[in-house]
Interface confidence: low
């Protein structure tokens, strides 16, 4: 008869830039050798050749370099293929043909995906709101796949649908940045959340801004930066937003604007005598002099490190003088788990099993949760530890130990607090000898 | 054991408001998303609000702002604030435990306090 | 909004019979992520909603292998084998599908011959 070749049912969902392994494996019989095997990845749709093995010999990759087999596994009858440094356009169906004296096809779907970034959120216009204006508030959240679910509420909680317009742009690599515009009337005040859901990873990123529509008091320089503190992913660029109110013939002559660091008072970047003095910070900081006259004070930190996390002091003097804080929270999504078991076969009821959850690379660290396949948590024999590396990034590696049932579903919920990114991995144990790992 | 417990329902007059709580304990509260389902005296079942983890909000339509769901996370403490409220607001309200997920279904439940709107 | 409708509204079985209740949507309940978050509960006389069944064909813990649940699209079939005398109450599915809102079926009363 045909020979049955096994897939996930379910598609494998790959973070962008990370590895994804296509599971596919068959049944050797005994005295089975490689040099029988004939074994073709192809994509579905195409039939494109990505990676076979013929000859007893692996043929190698057809797929722009970045498919692996797993050689050593090969005679126990694991056919999977590992794609490297996963990208959008990598979406779709591959299809693993094993041929023996049978032979047999199945597809397996893989699925792409990357978290959004906490939306930032801007209002124009921004100063002088009196009740009864009209404001334009943008929420713009960036990096993500696929297209996202946008959703507007008010202060209580009520969801705002009408006067939304949201956009959403593919860069050349195919994520998305998504722009939604929310215009509303001012009441006395209000709170105005925008959320950005990845349906994929059923990630929420969310924003809001607060709205007093009041005039500024006189006096001194009043400087404003956002309430919130400013999130940016590690390695992106990140704005920390400050502003003050020019009055009439106001020349760039007359400012000072130092940006330091709030509790070590370390000079990051000035302004004074009429130019940018530039960066004292690694070199990574900018102004924005086109809109400095304008009142814009923001500073650009380029290329964020974990070690920039922290609160920013920025001073404005022209004839007074004001200063206000802004933090900075650096983030770093988690990698889908790795799901690790041992024993990995001959399992039984009764078998005690350890499975390990690896997720790597974020920041800050993570909460992780287990949980049985019908949801039920699992608290009790969980050991998880997290390990910073030398950029401050954390790798997370959880250890349940259980004892099997007639079989399971253990599911591992890595979750970000602060990108409010989950990641997740399950692996399922049947009462069947098994003889590799099984992926999520 | 997991435990949600309502309480702060009674008879108020149309217009009114009225504040309901749900005791919440086994289980990390700040961990699961919450809601709140009523079921009306023709024993229909309506969802009425969701709060996540992360306390972003949901509402049903029909509340029209009337209604507001908050949390406490420090006091184990399930919030529903009704205010205007109508005859047509009658009914036994629970609170309900959402999946650690985001799946969005109702695992634990509790045993419900009755409200009732009438002159 | 998703309507979901159960049918029958009564459902008169002997112990020990097969039971099968109905649950249609008015849209497809598959999310575009792969997933579909169709779900049964049971309320018994006197008690609060039991989850039962979750995403179509999931039994909750502790619930007996006699409850099964199956359908795809917009039709769904939750089965009783052999049903039991603790079994009697009132069956609602639901879905988070598209949400907001989470939205119920009518219920189906399961009751003695």
């Known amino acids: 008869g045909a020979l049955e070749v096994q897939v996930p049912e379910d598609p494998v969902v790959a973070l962008v830039g990370t590895d994804a392994t296509l599971c596919c494996s068959f049944s050797p019989e005994p005295g089975f050798s490689l040099a029988q095997l004939n074994l073709i990845w192809q994509l579905t749709d195409t039939k494109q050749l990505v990676h076979s093995f013929a000859e007893g010999q692996d043929q190698g990759s057809a797929y722009a370099n970045r498919t692996a087999l797993f050689p050593d596994l090969l005679a126990q009858g694991n056919a999977s293929l590992r794609l490297q440094r996963v990208r959008v356009a990598d979406e779709g169906s591959f299809t693993c043909f094993v041929s023996i004296r049978d032979f047999g096809s199945a597809a397996v779907s893989l699925q792409v995906a990357a978290p959004y970034s906490k939306p930032s959120m801007t209002l124009e216009p921004n100063k002088d709101l009196r009740p009864g204006d009209t404001v334009t508030i943008t929420c713009s959240s960036y990096q993500g796949y696929p297209e996202a679910e946008v959703f507007w509420q008010d202060g209580q909680g009520v969801p705002l649908t009408g006067n939304v317009t949201t956009s959403q742009m593919a860069n050349e690599q195919g994520l998305f940045d998504v722009h939604s515009i929310l215009r509303v009337v001012l009441g006395a005040n209000g709170t105005y959340s925008c959320l950005v859901r990845n349906p994929v990873l059923q990630q929420d990123a969310h924003s809001s801004v607060t709205i007093t529509p009041q005039r500024s008091p006189t006096g001194a320089v009043e400087v404003q930066v956002p309430e919130d503190p400013v999130v940016a992913l590690v390695g992106t660029d990140a704005t920390l937003r400050c502003s003050f109110s020019p009055e009439p013939g106001f020349s760039l002559a007359q400012l000072n604007l130092i940006w330091q660091l709030t509790d070590t008072k370390q000079l990051v970047h000035s302004f004074t005598e009429g130019r940018d003095q530039g960066s004292a910070y690694a070199n990574r900081t900018a102004l924005f002099p086109d809109l400095l006259a304008q009142g814009n004070a923001s500073l650009r930190l380029q290329r964020v490190r974990v070690a920039d996390e922290g609160s920013f002091t920025c001073f404005v003097s022209i004839r007074d003088f004001g200063s206000a804080a802004v933090s900075l929270q650096v983030a770093a999504p988690y990698s889908k788990p790795s799901m690790t078991l041992e024993p990995n076969k001959d399992l039984r009821p009764g078998d005690t099993v350890t499975i390990t959850c690896s997720s790597y690379r974020g920041y800050p660290e993570a909460e992780v949760f287990w949980q049985d396949g019908q949801g039920v948590p699992l608290t009790g024999n969980v050991t998880t530890s997290q390990m910073a590396n030398e950029q401050g990034l954390f790798d997370v590696h959880s250890v349940l130990r259980v004892v099997l049932g007639a079989n399971g579903t253990y599911s591992c919920l890595v979750r970000n607090p602060v990108l409010q990114q989950d990641a997740h991995g399950s692996v399922t144990i049947t009462g069947q000898p098994m003889t590799f790992p099984p992926e999520a | 054991e997991v435990q949600l417990v309502e309480s702060g329902g009674g008879l108020v007059k149309p217009g009114g408001s009225l504040k309901l709580s749900c005791a919440v304990s086994g289980f990390t509260f700040s961990s699961y998303a919450m809601s709140w389902v009523r079921q009306t005296p023709e024993k229909r079942l309506e969802w009425v609000a969701s709060?996540?983890?992360?306390?972003?909000?949901f509402y049903s339509d029909s509340l029209k702002g009337r209604f507001t769901i908050s949390r406490d996370n420090s006091g184990n403490i399930l919030y529903l604030q009704m205010s205007s409220l109508r005859s047509e607001d009658t009914a036994m309200y629970f609170c309900?435990?959402?999946?650690?997920?985001?799946?969005?279904?109702?695992?634990?439940w509790g045993a419900g306090t009755t409200v009732t709107v009438s002159s | 909004d998703i309507v979901m409708t159960q049918a029958p509204l009564s459902l008169p079985v002997s112990l020990g019979d097969q039971a099968s209740i109905s649950c249609r949507s008015s849209q497809s309940l598959v999310h575009s992520n792969g997933n579909t978050y169709l779900h049964w509960y049971l309320q018994k006389p006197g008690q609060s909603p039991k989850l039962l069944i979750y995403?179509?064909?999931n039994r909750f813990s502790g619930v007996p292998d006699r409850f099964s649940g199956s359908g795809s699209g917009t039709d769904f079939t939750l089965k009783i084998s052999r049903v039991e005398a603790e079994d009697l109450g009132v069956y609602f599915c639901s879905q988070s599908t598209h949400v907001p809102p989470y939205t119920f079926g009518g219920g189906t009363k399961l009751e003695i011959k």
């Open positions: 309900a435990r959402g999946s650690i997920t985001t799946d969005w279904y109702f695992d634990v």
């Open positions: 995403k179509v064909s």
């Open positions: 709060i996540t983890d992360g306390g972003i909000t």
